[in-house]
């Protein structure tokens, strides 16, 4: 990241920024499907991407009210191998269903301490948080 | 989202928050592979997930210095159909390679206006930003 200089009012503290929660209303984040109950290892011919994939997955909620975003969703593969394109149900051992991971930028609410150690509301601390985005049908690794 | 109340010092403005950029150093975000040059429609037997996938993709950088995260990566499918698990190169018309989209929370730097209209540094405005995460091999939709 390039450095964003301090933007506090003159009374503020260095390395802090003013954050206005969106002037545009932001709806809660929802993935394409939250079909938590569909645990069948098959590729559908309709419905959202995660159920039509030959490496189908479901989403699981990760909620922390002291984090932005408060709700994250982790993908969980429904099959160890890929589903056959021909049948949509039988597994094909030539393909593995693997999770795709991503380190997402999140912000945690932490206490802010003033110069004399007194509490000054809270600050947001930026962190990387590992989430699984989807399941992908891949060719198994061939070890050289 | 649940409401995070104002946490400014008494001199601050309502609906603004103090944001301390991470007390933990955060390395720049890198996806599994930034192989921008490999544009061949084939599934590799080694390398990162996006090149071993039977719906292979490459990443394109989206950089905005007035946004957090400043760097985002968009997936771009390398094939219209899925690659055969058997050969790793020939396309199988029974499967489509489709982009998986996600509305990611991002923050934009905007000027902050004080009570008298004067600038008080900047604020961050939360928005949803559409990114393509990966390409997924799916069974084509069957229209009822």
């Amino acid at each position: 990241y390039s450095h964003w200089p301090s933007c506090c009012p003159s009374k503020g503290y260095p390395s802090e920024e003013l954050l206005r929660w969106s002037t545009v209303p932001v709806p809660p984040l929802k993935p394409a499907s939250l079909d938590f109950h569909s645990v069948s290892c098959r590729a559908s011919e309709d419905g959202p991407l995660n159920s039509r994939a030959i490496s189908p997955w479901r989403y699981e909620l990760d909620r922390d009210l002291n984090r932005l975003p408060q709700d994250l969703y982790h993908a969980r593969c429904l099959c160890p191998h890929c589903v056959s394109l021909q049948t949509g149900s039988h597994m094909d051992p030539r393909g593995n269903s693997e999770l795709l991971y991503h380190n997402q930028t999140v912000f945690y609410r932490r206490p802010c301490h003033g110069k004399k150690g007194n509490h000054k509301g809270y600050c947001l601390e930026r962190r990387l948080y590992r989430v699984s985005l989807a399941c992908v049908c891949v060719r198994p690794r061939v070890m050289g | 989202y649940s409401h995070w109340p104002s946490c400014c010092p008494s001199k601050g403005y309502p609906s603004e928050e103090l944001l301390r950029w991470s007390t933990v150093p955060v390395p720049p975000l890198k996806p599994a592979s930034l192989d921008f040059h490999s544009v061949s429609c084939r599934a590799s037997e080694d390398g990162p997930l996006n090149s071993r996938a039977i719906s292979p993709w490459r990443y394109e950088l989206d950089r905005d210095l007035n946004r957090l995260p400043q760097d985002l990566y968009h997936a771009r499918c390398l094939c219209p159909h899925c690659v055969s698990l058997q050969t790793g190169s020939h396309m199988d018309p029974r499967g489509n390679s489709e982009l998986l989209y996600h509305n990611q929370t991002v923050f934009y730097r905007r000027p902050c206006h004080g009570k008298k209209g004067n600038h008080k540094g900047y604020c961050l405005e939360r928005r949803l930003y559409r990114v393509s995460l990966a390409c997924v091999c799916v069974r084509p939709r069957v229209m009822g």
Epitope: E60, L61, D62, R63, L72, P111, Y122 | Y1, H3
Partner: antibody
């Protein structure tokens, strides 16, 4: 002030369905960040969290019991209902409902800040 | 699922004594919460977010810790402190609340 009160049958037979109601006052479950959970305590044993429901109707369950539990809310009646199917003598316990949603200067707390007095449920043939 | 292990299971102490109860998590967590429960009563919150005293809780109670190891300390036992103490955490994924098995504080 905040109060919570649990109600439900004192005695059930194995395989029956237990329905517990938590009636609360002094807060609204439609308030952003608010949640209500169910916790049980078998006689002489430890506390065990069962289920939780948030202001936005998102629900969480103890993984080992998920298939048997259902939590729901009626915001207009200030009630939360927990059902447990196919009860067994090991489900004999005092069942508590408790609120979560206290907001401090440092953020939300995941502690249960207000509890009901509990209701004892015995499962026996 | 994260497991919380409290130690000791039972502790005998005298009024005026300093008492420490430990809670160990099976993997690293951000915060710990503590409750006091007396026979026939519902639990009462003592400590929020590892070290913050709940409303009305005497200053002789304190909490500390980080990572996997957390501690509840009573600096000088009072007769009304003899009870069972539970640690608790919230895990965001999958969202679950977990309690320790409890520590019973008895009069010596």
């Amino acid at each position: 002030q905040v109060t919570l009160r649990e109600s439900g049958p004192a005695l059930l037979k194995p395989t029956q369905t237990l329905t517990l109601t938590c009636t609360f006052s002094g807060f609204s479950l439609s308030t952003s960040g608010m949640g209500l959970g169910w916790i049980r305590q078998p006689p002489g044993k430890a506390l065990e969290w069962l289920a939780h429901i948030w202001w936005d109707d998102v629900k969480h369950y103890k993984p080992a019991l998920k298939s048997r539990l259902t939590i729901s809310k009626d915001t207009s009646k200030n009630q939360v209902v927990l059902t447990i199917t196919n009860v067994d003598p090991v489900d004999t316990a005092t069942y508590y409902c408790a609120r979560m949603g206290q907001l401090h200067y440092y953020g939300y707390d995941y502690a249960m800040d207000y509890w009901g007095q509990g209701t004892l449920v015995t499962v026996s043939s | 699922e994260i497991v919380l292990t409290q130690s000791p299971a039972t502790l005998s102490a005298s009024p005026g004594e300093r008492v420490t109860i430990s809670c160990s998590a099976s993997s690293s967590v951000s915060y710990m919460y503590w409750y006091q429960q007396k026979p026939g009563q519902a639990p009462r919150p003592l400590i929020y977010r590892t070290s913050n005293l709940a409303s009305g809780v005497p200053a002789r109670f304190s909490g500390s810790g980080s990572g996997t190891d957390y501690t509840l300390t009573i600096s000088s036992m009072e007769p009304e402190d003899f009870a069972t103490y539970y640690c608790q955490l919230y895990h965001s994924y999958p969202p679950t609340w977990t309690f320790g098995q409890g520590t019973k504080l008895e009069i010596k």
